[in-house]
C-alpha cells in the first residue's frame, strides 16, 4: 500500500533571466527512493537523480539546469517559455511511483514577485 505523500513548492514565480529551485519532498513512507525524475510541462525529461549512479542532466538542458539542492532541481537563465508545469516523479521500492506537480510562472523582471520560498534571488 502506498502511504507516502509528496510535498512540493506548489505555484511559484520567478524573474526572467533569473533562477529558481524546484523542490519536492516525499514523506510518510519508509520506501526506498531509487530514482527521482524531473519532467517539463511537455513531458520532456530534464534530469534524473539515481540513488546509485547520481545525477544525469538531459544534454539539451545541461547549460541551464543544475542538480540540487538535495533531490531538487535548479533552473537557470529563465525565459518566458519556461512557464508551465513541472513534475517530480519518485520511483520507490516497494511502494512504486509518487508524482508531484509544480507550476512555474516566469515574469518580466519589472513585475516579478518573490512568491517562492525556495526561489533564488
Amino acid at each position: 500500500m502506498m502511504t507516502g505523500t509528496i510535498e512540493t513548492t506548489g505555484n511559484i514565480s520567478a524573474k526572467k533571466g533569473g533562477s529558481v529551485i524546484l523542490q519536492c519532498h516525499l514523506s510518510s513512507t519508509m520506501a526506498q527512493v531509487t530514482q527521482v525524475n524531473w519532467e517539463q510541462h511537455d513531458h520532456s525529461l530534464l534530469a534524473i537523480r539515481n540513488a546509485e549512479l547520481g545525477w544525469h542532466i538531459y544534454p539539451a538542458f545541461k547549460d541551464r539546469v543544475a542538480p540540487g539542492p538535495g533531490l531538487g532541481l535548479t533552473l537557470q537563465s529563465l525565459t518566458m517559455n519556461d512557464t508551465g508545469e513541472y513534475f517530480c516523479t519518485y520511483h520507490t521500492y516497494p511502494d512504486g511511483t509518487y508524482r508531484g506537480r509544480i507550476f512555474l510562472e516566469v515574469l518580466e523582471s519589472s513585475v516579478a514577485e518573490h512568491s517562492a520560498r525556495f526561489q533564488i534571488p
Epitope: 531509487t34 530514482q35 525524475n37 519532467e39 513531458h43 520532456s44 525529461l45 534524473i48 539515481n50 546509485e52 549512479l53 547520481g54 544525469h56 542532466i57 538531459y58 544534454p59 545541461k62 520511483h91 511511483t97
Partner: antibody, heavy 121, light 108 residues
Amino acid sequence: QVQLVQSGAEVKKPGASVKVSCKASGYTFPAYYMHWVRQAPGQGLEWMGIINPSLGLTSYARKFQGRVTMTRDTSTSTVYMELSSLRSEDTAVYYCARGGRTTWIGAFDIWGQGTMVTVSS
Amino acid sequence: EIVMTQSPATLSVSPGERATLSCRASQSVSSNLAWYQQKPGQAPRLLIYGASTRATGIPARFSGSGSGTEFTLTISSLQSEDFAVYYCQQYVVWPPLTFGGGTKVEIK
C-alpha cells in the same frame, strides 16, 4: 572500430561462480556506461546491471543483488561480471553492451558477441 | 519497475509488405525508448533510439514513433533480412532497465 570482445563459453556446476570479461576498444572507455544483459535459451532479454567505468559505480537489478558483482579495469579497458551461487536457471547467453555517455543514460549501441554460460551438474 | 509490453507476439508478413510493431510502457518513459533487432545466434542490434532516431547504418525503411507510453516501430517494406525478433526497451528508470517480451516477425 568500436567493439566489445567477450570471454569464451563456460560450463559450471550449481553453486559455483562464473566471471565473464568484456574488453572494449575503439573508443574512450571511461566515458560510456557498460551494461550486462542476459538471454536464457529461447527467451527474451533481461537487464542485469550497469557500471560506470570511470568511477566504478554500479546499479544492479534487484533480482541479482547479492549474487552479481560488476567491476572494471581501466588499464585494460575491460569490464567484468561475476555471478555467484549459480543455478540451472542461470544458463544463458550473457552480453555486455555499451550504453550512453556517463552524463546521460542512453540506448545500447554496441554489443559484445555474447558468452554462453551453462550451469549443469 | 516499468513494464514494457509488446504486441503482437508474432507477426506474419510477406516480403515487400509493411510491418507495424507496438510497444507500451506501464508509465511514461518520455522519448527514452529504443528498438533492437535480433537474429538467431546473434547479439541484438540497435535500430532506433530516442523513440524515433535511426542508429548509424540503419536503413530508412525502419522508423520509430511515439512518446510517453505508446510507441511504434514500422518497417515500410520488409526485406528478407528483416525477418527477426524485435525488442523495445526503456532506458530512463533503473534499476531495472526493462525490455519488452519481443515480437517475432516471420515470413507469411
